[in-house]
């Protein structure tokens, strides 16, 4: 008799999830000498332990503590790049500007990037059929709680000038419901962080508007200012040129506005 299984609204666990996490861990620790001491089998065991046999709508930050402990990593606190709804460009940027870090450039972020996972209450099975959707099912699901936990820690780690890349093509350039808007903004430490600098990335080639005047950016400025952190904003009119100039800052065309 087939066992009844809860049907969730979201996609199921990414196929080959255990193998993917383990392989990513091995690759990361090979590339980053400061993380060579990490035992990837223990990392996988801790990851698995956070959600296996637990109801996928009842996950807590405490469930991830063993994994967080194994994934302890010091990041240069003044070289942190946050992003919202523009992950690919943010990652392209840190691949060129190697001294800056997004969350996905850390071990924990790298392990989980673009993956989905969940288990089932009282069984050791991974659910490959469906997982809870944040909106339609529940917010305390394994994926959402993981990203909330690591994002909070990442924001708490930041100091001096923190940069955030925002998508100027979206109707809400700053979205209070994004991970950046709901978690990271509120966990920047005013005693450590002097300035949040927003980079608003333009989508259209001929778009010369000053998106730093957008009402949602003004809302972000208000939230940040109330937290005693300075705010500044820059338009990145040509993201392609922006990346090119990060690669080749001496290029003569890089002195003009990008």
């Amino acid at each position: 008799v087939p066992r009844w299984r809860q049907q969730w609204s979201g996609p199921g666990t990414t196929k080959r999830f255990p193998e993917t996490v383990l392989a990513r861990c091995v690759k990361y620790t090979e590339i980053h000498p400061e993380m060579r001491h990490v035992d990837c089998q223990s990392v996988w065991d801790a990851f698995k332990g956070a959600f296996i046999s637990k109801h996928p709508c009842n996950i807590t930050e405490e469930d991830y503590q063993p994994l967080m402990k194994l994934g302890t990593q010091t990041v240069p606190c003044n070289k942190i790049l946050l992003w919202s709804r523009i992950k690919d460009l943010a990652h392209q940027f840190t691949q060129v500007q190697r001294d800056m870090f997004t969350l996905e450039d850390t071990l924990l972020g790298y392990l989980a990037d673009d993956l989905t996972w969940c288990g089932e209450f009282n069984t050791s099975k991974i659910n490959y059929q469906s997982c809870p959707d944040w909106r339609k099912d529940c917010s305390n699901n394994p994926v959402s709680v993981f990203w909330k936990t690591v994002s909070r820690r990442f924001a708490e780690a930041a100091c001096d000038v923190v940069h955030v890349m925002l998508n100027g093509s979206r109707s809400k350039i700053f979205d209070k419901n994004s991970t950046f808007g709901s978690v990271e903004v509120h966990n920047l430490q005013p005693e450590k962080v002097q300035t949040l600098e927003a980079w608003v990335i333009h989508g259209g080639r001929e778009d010369s508007r000053d998106l730093c005047q957008d009402p949602t950016i003004k809302e972000l400025e208000s939230i940040i200012s109330k937290r005693n952190i300075q705010f500044s904003c820059k338009n990145i009119y040509r993201p392609d040129k922006f990346l090119q100039c990060v690669k080749n800052p001496e290029d003569s065309s890089c002195t003009s506005e990008i």
Epitope: G71, T72, V75, P76, I80, V150, R153
Partner: nanobody, 124 residues
Amino acid sequence: QLQLQESGPGLVKPSETLALTCNVSGGSISSSSYYWGWIRQPPGKRLEWIGSIYYSGSTDYNPSLKSRVTISVDTSKNQFSLKLTSVTAADTAVYYCAGGYNYGPVGQWPSDYRGQGTLVTVSS
């Protein structure tokens, strides 16, 4: 509940060495759960991170102070200390010891726990 308490002289002469100790209670200084550091706040200025020491024993120092700073741990006394050499009037500040949870991505600047602070004046 972790508690930190700074101790040391309130007055140091220019060119001498500033030495402060931080006593940790409510937790073990040798626990892998924490990392430790020093920060300071000169009069009328922002807090400034001085340096940190990690579970592994490795240290990280503010580049602007690196040549003058040493942070070390004494596990037998459950305390850690700061030495800052060749001080000048610019080193006058309230000095704080701090502790941070050692999990996930962490910055060099621990900010989960902090002592009350001790004012150190550099003057002859």
